[in-house]
Amino acid sequence: DAEFRHDSGYEVHHQKLVFFAEDVGSNKGAIIGLMVGGVVIA
């Protein structure tokens, strides 16, 4: 998990989240997303 401090004086936490593709479809493999401030953005 990476943590970045910004000039605004608060910290934004970045966390990689990994999901299995077959949980949401028929593909195999992993889906990697990025959660920033509690919201998955990718």
Partner: nanobody
Framework: EVQLLESGGGLVQPGGSLRLSCAAS????????MGWFRQAPGKGREFVAA????????YYADSVKGRFTISRDNAKNTVYLQMNSLRPEDTAIYYC?????????????????WGQGTLVTVSS
């Protein structure tokens, strides 16, 4: 929820191998993605590897990629972690966990069932 019981830990020399097993009780085993985490003395519990419900998909932490292999046998309700080329830094208690489908498999909070852990010590 499933009950989990790990086995297979022990003392091994650097470069050696171990195979951990995690036996699950309950008819819902194949509803869960299964993962292995580990916790070294004085450190937090960290993700090691996970396998999908079908066993088709796997994912590994960078620190174990190419050395560890996770697999599952849904007929036996068991998950395995084959650990090769072991290093002293692999020393930890290894925990098996069950994560319901659709949850992130690399974070501890996704797992609602845990075993009691099995100790792996890599030392000469």
């Amino acid at each position: 929820e499933v009950q989990l019981l790990e086995s297979g830990g022990g003392l091994v020399q650097p470069g050696g191998s171990l195979r951990l097993s995690c036996a699950a009780s309950g008819r819902t085993f194949n509803n869960y993605n299964m993962g292995w985490f580990r916790q070294a003395p004085g450190k937090g519990r960290e993700f090691v590897a996970a396998v999908s419900r079908s066993g088709v998909s796997t994912y590994y932490a960078d620190s174990v990629k190419g050395r560890f292999t996770i697999s599952r046998d849904n007929a036996k309700n068991t998950v395995y972690l084959q650990m090769n080329s072991l290093r002293p830094e692999d020393t930890a208690i290894y925990y098996c966990g069950a994560a319901y489908r659709g949850t992130a498999i690399n974070v501890r909070r996704s797992y609602d069932s845990w075993g009691q852990g099995t100790l792996v010590t890599v030392s000469s």
